[in-house]
């Protein structure tokens, strides 16, 4: 297993609709054809897997149908979008990248993106 640098923004504010997008960039030392991207959430020192996708270079990322993540790839960059976020989902979202094929296997873990999520203010009751 060899180490690889992964860069991601430090702080992102999700939209009022609970959507957050950020780029995860990795310094690929070779010509990988198969890449696995995993998003981990760290909150109160607990780490959980949010979503994961394996893709062939040049193809779209394919997450599971019920995943809250979507993404696109371009070269050594992965543009990740996480949706359905609520205030309680505020936390550090860490991008983990694995170059699966061809060997050697490379692993890179970013420092994390702190995603702040603000629940929208409830609309005042109005009579029409």
């Amino acid at each position: 297993c060899k180490a690889m640098h992964v860069a991601q923004p430090a702080v992102v504010l999700a939209s009022s609709r609970g959507i957050a997008s950020f780029v995860c960039e990795y310094a690929s030392p070779g010509k990988a054809t198969e890449v696995r991207v995993t998003v981990l959430r760290q909150a109160d020192s607990q780490v959980t897997e949010v979503c994961a996708a394996t893709y062939m270079m040049g193809n779209e990322l394919t997450f599971l149908d019920d995943s809250i993540c979507t993404g696109t790839s371009s070269g050594n960059q992965v543009n990740l979008t996480i949706q359905g976020l609520r205030a309680m989902d505020t936390g550090l979202y860490i991008c983990k990248v694995e170059l699966m094929y061809p060997p050697p296997y490379y692993l890179g873990i970013g420092n994390g993106t702190q995603i702040y999520v603000i629940d929208p203010e409830p609309c005042p009751d109005s009579d029409f």
Epitope: A10, V11, L13, S15, S16, S21, A43
Partner: antibody, heavy 117, light 108 residues
Amino acid sequence: QVQLVQSGAEVKKPGASVKVSCKASGYTFTSYGISWVRQAPGQGLEWMGWISAYNGNTNYAQKLQGRVTMTTDTSTSTAYMELRSLRSDDTAVYYCARVGVNWFDPWGQGTLVTVSS
Amino acid sequence: EIVLTQSPGTLSLSPGERATLSCRASQSVSSSYLAWYQQKPGQAPRLLIYGASSRATGIPDRFSGSGSGTDFTLTISRLEPEDFAVYYCQQYGSSPWTFGQGTKVEIK
């Protein structure tokens, strides 16, 4: 080193608007956020809101909603805070601060805004 | 809105003494999102502690933070002359982000 430098003091009349700038250096501007905090004379710190320099999304304190606008110019690594319909109780020192993973650091030197007729 | 109440309002102590400052939240705050700042007259606030207990870069180890839930504490083990200032706690786990009203540490 990481630094935030704010624009100079302003004197405004009630009802006018003020726009304070905050120029960042020493770090990747779009990787962080900028928060604005004000402090009336002899009073404590009041959080006004913040902007994510990465995507431009904003979160404002409810009491200022509709009067405040926070923006960034990523080409010059500068954040702006505009406050409209100024009142005498808006007289304060206005600070910008970098929003990190779980901290505000560093802070700008502050900009005194005086609202007086 | 989470209200942070700091006590005491003023702490009168001598250099070399221990200072214990309290910050109580009206609702539970994740300790990841509780910070302490120091402010001296005419200066901008300075980050001391983040994540309730982690010291910021360059902050002397006489400053320490602790607590969880609704009760947080900033301790200055031995007051130095430059430590006399106003201290604020802040939470940013729940919007709106809020500050306590401050505790002034003054020379006795």
